[in-house]
Interface confidence: low
C-alpha cells in the first residue's frame, strides 16, 4: 500500500499556503483528486509529489494515491482543507444525475472542518427540503440524499454557519431519473386461441412501463395491425392496451399473433397461435399402452389426454367388467388443465385387488359428440401350486396344478428325505415340463396349468416337489409319500 507524507488523514491550511503531498510506493504511483488549479505534479519512479505554492478553497478535497501495478489495488488518501473565511464550500459538480432509489451525492466539500456542526442542506432561495428527504453529511464528500425520488429533482444549496450567518454554496442541480429496468412488460391474452369459423374472438395485447415513452403494436403473421390504443396510468406504471375484436372469424384470421413493445432499453415480444376450425373437435389419447399389466396389490395411474373445442360438457371413468359392478371412486379421478384446450385426466387405482382387473373406459363429451378411450388392465399373480397323487390309465401319477399370471412354468424335483422344500444338496432328479397343459385361460383371470409326473413307485423317504414360477414370483408344493409303497397300485374299480 502506498504511503503519503505528511502521514495524517487530514491537513488544514490557509489560502495562499504552500502544500506538498508526497506519495511513495513499491512501484510507480498515481495521484487522483478533485479537479482544481495550481497543482504541480512531479513523478520520480516509485514516488510522486503533488504541490502548490498558492492553495485556494478549490484545492479542498480528498487526494488518493494508488499503485496501478498492485494486484491488491491498495491506496492511501489524505483530505486537504483550505479554510477560506469567505468560501466555506468547494463545489465539485453543479449537476448530479442519479436513478430513482440511488443515493445522490451533492459534492459540496466543507473547506473548514470546524464548520461541520452548523451545516445544512436547503433548496435554492432558502426553501426547506421536501418531506421525506433523508440525507446525511460528510465533510469530506458533501451531502448525500439517500434513496432519491423523482420528485426530489431540484436545485440545492449547501449552507454553513459562519460568524452567526448562513453562507451558501453555489447551487447544485439534482436530476433523479426514473429507473427503466428494461423493455416494457408485456401480456398477450389468451396464450392460445381456438374458434369455430363464424364465432367471435378477442385478442388483447398490453404493455406497461414506469416511463411513458414506449411503443406497442400487435401483428398478425408479419402484418402490423392498425388497432386503436387505450392508455392508462395506475400503480405508478403507464399502460397501453391494444384490443383486437373479431365478430366472425374465418380461416384467414388464423395464424401467429405477436405483441411487441419497445423503449430506449430495447424490445420485448410475445406470441400466441390462433386456430380456426370448421367444427367442434374432441380427441382422446394416452401416452400409456392401452393394455396394462400390474402385479396384484400394486397401484396404477391411468392417464388420458383430451384435446377439445368447445370445452367439455361431461366426462367420467367407467369400469366395464368383467368382475364386480363397482365403479371408480370420484375421489380417485383427477383432472388437470394444461391450457385452455388441453386437459389431462387421471384415474388412480391404488393397491389393486383381483376384482379390479378388467376394462376401464374414459368417456368425454362436448358439442362435437362423445369419445371414449378404453384401457385393459390385467393383474399379475405369483403362482399358487397344489399336488395330488392319482392313477391315470393304471399308472401312479403326481398331478400338479399351478395358477397365476403370466402363465407359470413348471419344474418337478425329486429329493432325498422328507422336506417342505428341496434344497440343492438333496436333489436327486429334476424334470422340466416345457408344455404343461392349460386348464383355463380367460381374459383378466389367472392362467391355470396342469403338469403330470408318472411315478411307477413312490420311493420311501423321498419328497416330490412341484415348482412353478413366472415373472412375478414362484410357488411350490412338496408331496411326501405317507409310507413306503403306499398308493403304488391303482385303486380298486
Amino acid at each position: 500500500i502506498p504511503v503519503i507524507e505528511p502521514s495524517v488523514p487530514e491537513l488544514v491550511v490557509k489560502p495562499g499556503a504552500t502544500v506538498t503531498l508526497r506519495c511513495v510506493g513499491n512501484g510507480s504511483v498515481e495521484w487522483d483528486g478533485p479537479p482544481s488549479p495550481h497543482w504541480t505534479l512531479y513523478s520520480d519512479g516509485s514516488s510522486s509529489i503533488l504541490s502548490t505554492n498558492n492553495a485556494t478553497f478549490q484545492n479542498t478535497g480528498t487526494y488518493r494515491c494508488t499503485e496501478p501495478g498492485d494486484p491488491l489495488g491498495g491506496s492511501a488518501a489524505i483530505h486537504l482543507y483550505v479554510k477560506d473565511p469567505a468560501r466555506p464550500w468547494n463545489v465539485l459538480a453543479q449537476e448530479v444525475v442519479v436513478f430513482e432509489d440511488q443515493d445522490a451525492l451533492l459534492p459540496c466539500l466543507l473547506t473548514d472542518p470546524v464548520l461541520e456542526a452548523g451545516v445544512s442542506l436547503v433548496r435554492v432561495r432558502g426553501r426547506p427540503l421536501m418531506r421525506h428527504t433523508n440525507y446525511s453529511f460528510s465533510p469530506w464528500h458533501g451531502f448525500t440524499i439517500h434513496r432519491a425520488k423523482f420528485i426530489q429533482s431540484q436545485d440545492y444549496q449547501c449552507s454553513a454557519l459562519m460568524g452567526g450567518r448562513k453562507v451558501m454554496s453555489i447551487s447544485i442541480r439534482l436530476k433523479v431519473q426514473k429507473v427503466i429496468p428494461g423493455p416494457p412488460a408485456l401480456t398477450l391474452v389468451p396464450a392460445e386461441l381456438v374458434r369455430i369459423r363464424g364465432e367471435a374472438a378477442q385478442i388483447v395485447c398490453s404493455a406497461s412501463s414506469v416511463d411513458v415513452n414506449f411503443d406497442v403494436f400487435l401483428q398478425h403473421n408479419n402484418t402490423k395491425l392498425a388497432i386503436p390504443q387505450q392508455s392508462d396510468f395506475h400503480n405508478n406504471r403507464y399502460q397501453k392496451v391494444l384490443t383486437l375484436n373479431l365478430d366472425q372469424v374465418d380461416f384467414q384470421h388464423a395464424g401467429n399473433y405477436s405483441c411487441v413493445a419497445s423503449n430506449v432499453q430495447g424490445k420485448h415480444s410475445t406470441s400466441m397461435f390462433f386456430r380456426v376450425v370448421e367444427s367442434a373437435y374432441l380427441n382422446l389419447s394416452s401416452e400409456q399402452n392401452l393394455i396394462q399389466e400390474v402385479t396384484v396389490g400394486e397401484g396404477l395411474n391411468l392417464k388420458v389426454m383430451v384435446e377439445a373445442y368447445p370445452g367439455l360438457q361431461g366426462f367420467n371413468w367407467t369400469y366395464l367388467g368383467p368382475f364386480s359392478d363397482h365403479q371408480p371412486e370420484p375421489k380417485l379421478a383427477n383432472a388437470t388443465t394444461k391450457d385452455t384446450y388441453r386437459h389431462t385426466f387421471t384415474l388412480s387405482l391404488p393397491r389393486l385387488k383381483p376384482s379390479e382387473a378388467g376394462r376401464y373406459s374414459f368417456l368425454a363429451r362436448n358439442p362435437g359428440g362423445w369419445r371414449a378411450l378404453t384401457f385393459e388392465l390385467t393383474l399379475r399373480y405369483p403362482p399358487e401350486v397344489s399336488v395330488i397323487w392319482t392313477f391315470i390309465n393304471g399308472s401312479g401319477t403326481l398331478l400338479c396344478a399351478a395358477s397365476g399370471y403370466p402363465q407359470p412354468n413348471v419344474t418337478w424335483l425329486q429329493c432325498s428325505g422328507h422336506t417342505d422344500r428341496c434344497d440343492e444338496a438333496q436333489v436327486l432328479q429334476v424334470w422340466d415340463d416345457p408344455y404343461p397343459e392349460v386348464l383355463s385361460q380367460e381374459p383378466f383371470h389367472k392362467v391355470t396349468v396342469q403338469s403330470l409326473l408318472t411315478v411307477e413307485t413312490l420311493e420311501h423317504n423321498q419328497t416330490y416337489e412341484c415348482r412353478a414360477h413366472n415373472s412375478v414370483g414362484s410357488g411350490s408344493w412338496a408331496f411326501i409319500p405317507i409310507s413306503a409303497g403306499a398308493h403304488t397300485h391303482p385303486p380298486d374299480e
Partner: antibody, heavy 126, light 107 residues
Framework: EVTLKESGPALVKPTQTLTLTCTFS??????????VGWIRQPPGKALEWLAN???????YYNPSLKNRLTISKDTSKNQVVLTMTNMDPVDTATYYC??????????????????WGQGTMVTVSS | DIQMTQSPSSLSASVGDRVTITCLAS??????LAWYQKKPGKAPKLLIY???SLQDGVPSRFSGSGSGTDFTLTISSLQPEDFATYFC?????????FGGGTKVEIK
C-alpha cells in the same frame, strides 16, 4: 463468506473501561459504502444501537452514550474496536457487531446491518 | 429519537399458520426499515430490507410491507424452523432504533 466475531472480557468491574474487538472476514472496510456497527442487548430487554464506523472513517454514536463510546478501525487487521468507559452494572448485556454493506449503486451504500456476529456476553459486577 | 413499537411481544402458532408482526414508528421513516430473525445462541439474520425487499437466500414465505410509520412482517405458512424471535430496525435517522421483538412459539 462473510463472518464477524466479537471478543473481549466476559467480566468487567464498575468504573472500568470495556474494550471489545470485532474481527471480520469476507469483506474489506476499505470498500466504498462498507460499514461496521455495534449493538447491545441487556438481558430481557430490546436491542440498542451503539455506534457505526464507515469505510471513510465517518463515525456515528448513540447520543445517549456518545461521551462514553469510541469506535475505531484497523483495516489491515480487519478489525473494529469499540471502547466504553465508566462501565456500570446496567451495561451488562450481549454485545454484537454487524456489517453495513455492500454498495448497491456507485453512490449508494446500504443503510442496514446485513450480517451479524453471534455476540459476546459482558457482565459488569464488582 | 424515533421510537419503534413492535407487537405482539409474543405469539403462539402452529406449523402452517399465517403469522403477522407489526412495527410502528413514532415518526415518518419512509421505507428505511429492516426485519431480522434471532434464534438463541445464533447471530441475527436479515430477512427484509427497505421495508419490503427480500434478502437473498431468505424463503419467499417471508414478506414485508408498509411505508411511513406502519410496517408489517408476514410469514405466509409457518415452518418448524421459523420459531424464533423477530425484530425490526429503523435506519432512517440516527440514532438507529430497534423494536422490542416478537417471540414466535409453538402452540
Amino acid at each position: 463468506e462473510v463472518t464477524l466475531k466479537e471478543s473481549g472480557p466476559a467480566l468487567v468491574k464498575p468504573t472500568q473501561t470495556l474494550t471489545l474487538t470485532c474481527t471480520f472476514s469476507g469483506f474489506s472496510l476499505t470498500t466504498y459504502g462498507m460499514g461496521v456497527g455495534w449493538i447491545r442487548q441487556p438481558p430481557g430487554k430490546a436491542l440498542e444501537w451503539l455506534a457505526n464506523i464507515w469505510w471513510d472513517d465517518d463515525k456515528y454514536y448513540n447520543p445517549s452514550l456518545k461521551n462514553r463510546l469510541t469506535i475505531s478501525k484497523d483495516t489491515s487487521k480487519n478489525q473494529v474496536v469499540l471502547t466504553m468507559t465508566n462501565m456500570d452494572p446496567v451495561d451488562t448485556a450481549t454485545y454484537y457487531c454487524a456489517r453495513i454493506g455492500p454498495i448497491k449503486y456507485p453512490t449508494a451504500p446500504y443503510r442496514y446491518f446485513d450480517f451479524w456476529g453471534q455476540g459476546t456476553m459482558v457482565t459488569v459486577s464488582s | 429519537d424515533i421510537q419503534m413499537t413492535q407487537s405482539p411481544s409474543s405469539l403462539s402458532a402452529s406449523v402452517g399458520d399465517r403469522v403477522t408482526i407489526t412495527c410502528l414508528a413514532s415518526e415518518d421513516i419512509y421505507d428505511n426499515l429492516a426485519w431480522y430473525q434471532k434464534k438463541p445462541g445464533k447471530a441475527p439474520k436479515l430477512l427484509i430490507y427497505y421495508a419490503s425487499s427480500l434478502q437473498d437466500g431468505v424463503p419467499s414465505r417471508f414478506s414485508g410491507s408498509g411505508s411511513g410509520t406502519d410496517f408489517t412482517l408476514t410469514i405466509s405458512s409457518l415452518q418448524p424452523e421459523d420459531f424464533a424471535t423477530y425484530f425490526c430496525l429503523q435506519d432512517s435517522e440516527y440514532p438507529w432504533t430497534f423494536g422490542g421483538g416478537t417471540k414466535v412459539e409453538i402452540k
